[in-house]
Amino acid sequence: PASLAGCYSAPLKGPLWTCLLLCAALRTLLASPSNEVNLLDSRTVLGDLGWIAFPKNGWEEIGEVDENYAPIHTYQVCKVMEQNQNNWLLTSWISNEGASRIFIELKFTLRDCNSLPGGLGTCKETFNMYYFESDDENGRNIKDNQYIKIDTIAADESFTELDLGDRVMKLNTEVRDVGPLSKKGFYLAFQDVGACIALVSVRVYYKKCPSVVRHLAVFPDTITGADSSQLLEVSGSCVNHSVTDDPPKMHCSAEGEWLVPIGKCMCKAGYEEKNGTCQVCRPGFFKASPHSQTCSKCPPHSYTHEEASTSCVCEKDYFRRESDPPTMACTRPPSAPRNAISNVNETSVFLEWIPPADTGGGKDVSYYILCKKCNSHAGVCEECGGHVRYLPQQIGLKNTSVMMADPLAHTNYTFEIEAVNGVSDLSPGTRQYVSVNVTTNQAAPSPVTNVKKGKIAKNSISLSWQEPDRPNGIILEYEIKYFEKDQETSYTIIKSKETTITAEGLKPASVYVFQIRARTAAGYGVFSRRFEFETTPVFGASNDQSQIP
């Protein structure tokens, strides 16, 4: 016929067939994969399908029932005797629910022509499937040439054995896809051209990438694209209590599979990932950064009583430096070093100790040496200042010994060895140190520097001076060497326990050179620089108390 208009639309009721036990095979397949959304499944329709056949003696509905006596809508045609068959079966309108590419799964049996008696030359082993797009739910009364052919359907395995009753019937399954679709819905049509077919099931579906949580991002149900090779980029949204610095995306393939994940979400500070969700850190646990994987137990000497903690609070008397990460244990300043001993020689003091009994919980203990110089008479101590050198260093000392070079001789020192760590400066408590008192050995004194002239006469010169800056012991005596200028090889030595002398027997109006040195038990110091003084002329007056520059 040139037109399908006015198709026979009375319900198609054929004989009530027995349960063919194809039912079992069908029903086990009723559950579609999660990425397939059925638009029509003839197996699940309980009432009339509303399909129509034209002509009316072509396709017929046969009332199959399954093992639960639920109907199976089966359509059969076996017009193999006559040539030029053109039997149409039209579905009702099928909404595409926004899908632009749909799939049609047919389950059918198609009888091998050789199994029919008499070798019918008119018998065919294929049928045709068509579709027609329409926004109109009542638009199937159209000319058959408006239907677009999807494909010619042939059995992958046409059969001669019909396993029915206590046997298993062989069902052929063929799937075709159609797209892109542009209207709200469509009709399907099945054209028989002279085959012996039973159409047992028609399932129309589209594919979607099902809603999924991946990398803590929720990706919504996404209908696949119209093109079989198309990948749709879909943005995910982070689950509750998660954040991202690399927005999550995935690609939905035409087969309904999520591919090529990009980016991810991370549970924010105070939350950790469990079963695809972000769960709060329990009291006693914390997570400082989204980049951390799990909530961690509070580090030693810290605690938290709240949920969702991003850090833990230090216990009393314990501290954490500002630069320390929250994962670091809280520590306290170390106790004092122990068992400090000293060793003194002429040029240095060597100190040694053992580490404190309590390091405060950290491994960053270092030592600070404070040097005090004490006046033995007054009992007053002052910081040593720069005259002592520390080897290897005074501050941040890692080993448990130090050497002080260039100490003053015959001096009382107090060395305070303090153990410190990163939190020592945060603690309001008193310093923890061990003291070592050291008296250095006597040494040769330093040179005399300050010499003043006293009474100068024609035959004598009186001088006075101050004790050397560094006596380095008890001054036993001074030695004064003098000679007439330019007569250095002919000198005179005077010894004096005082800091004054008078040189006599000198020539009038002559220049004399004086040098003074002090002696301790350790020996003489070096001579002072040369001081020049001139005797008066025979008739000159004496000159008192002028300091020699």
Partner: antibody
Framework: QVQLLQSGAEVKKPGASVKVPCKAS????????MSWVRQAPGQGLEWMGW????????TYAQGFTGRFVFSLDTSVSTAYLQISSLKAEDTAVYYC??????????????WGQGTLVTVSS | EIVLTQSPATLSVSPGERATLSCRAS??????LAWYQQKPGQAPRLLIY???TRATGIPDRFSASGSGTDFTLTISRVEPEDFAVYYC????????FGQGTKVEIK
């Protein structure tokens, strides 16, 4: 109503011929093959063969070639069985039966009432 | 030619009882087997085709099974109108009938 109507009983002498008609009604005659079955008195059923009502192509069972001819007149939706050179052993009831071909199998689903052909001298 | 052998030749049953008829083929006919019922003076009636599919209008007390060479027709509860001769017929290769089984009242 689908039915096959056969003629009444025939009595023939040996060597004669007989033509048994089978008129179909209630369906499209050319959509179904027509089969012929013989049942001798007190005996079982014997399939004689069938004719494709669309092409007129006959198929004969073993033992039913030569003297037996299937034919059609589609204009009156009638199939015919002609037996020539009748013998006494041809005495039997001859049935025509419509052949229903389905995906699930074949069967003779509509039968004529039968025509008794008696061959006697 | 495929030979069909039916057994028993005669089956005596009481109304309401179960009747089981057998048909054996000399070679495999797959599922290409039909069963017919014939009452005296009447034409045969198609009961089953495709080895197990009931024909239109056949009560569900008639069931059949089998494949290959061994087939069974079962009448679950025999009714008075079921007393008749039953024939099996194969259409796997040419067409042949079995010799029939008579179901009679016991």
């Amino acid at each position: 109503q689908v039915q096959l109507l056969q003629s009444g009983a025939e009595v023939k002498k040996p060597g004669a011929s007989v033509k048994v008609p089978c008129k179909a009604s209630g369906y499209t005659f050319t959509s179904y093959a027509m089969s012929w079955v013989r049942q001798a008195p007190g005996q079982g059923l014997e399939w004689m063969g069938w004719i494709n009502t669309n092409t007129g192509n006959p198929t004969y069972a073993q033992g039913f070639t030569g003297r037996f001819v299937f034919s059609l007149d589609t204009s009156v939706s009638t199939a015919y069985l002609q037996i020539s050179s009748l013998k006494a052993e041809d005495t039997a009831v001859y049935y025509c039966a419509r052949v229903r071909l389905t995906v699930y199998g074949d069967g003779m689903d509509v039968w004529g009432q039968g025509t008794l052909v008696t061959v006697s001298s | 030619e495929i030979v069909l052998t039916q057994s028993p030749a005669t089956l005596s049953v009481s109304p309401g009882e179960r009747a089981t008829l057998s048909c054996r083929a000399s070679q495999s006919v797959s599922s290409n087997l039909a069963w017919y019922q014939q009452k005296p003076g009447q034409a045969p009636r198609l009961l089953i085709y495709g080895a197990s599919t009931r024909a239109t209008g056949i009560p569900d007390r008639f069931s059949a099974s089998g494949s290959g060479t061994d087939f069974t027709l079962t009448i679950s509860r025999v009714e008075p109108e079921d007393f008749a001769v039953y024939y099996c017929q194969q259409y796997g290769s040419s067409w042949t009938f079995g010799q029939g089984t008579k179901v009679e009242i016991k």
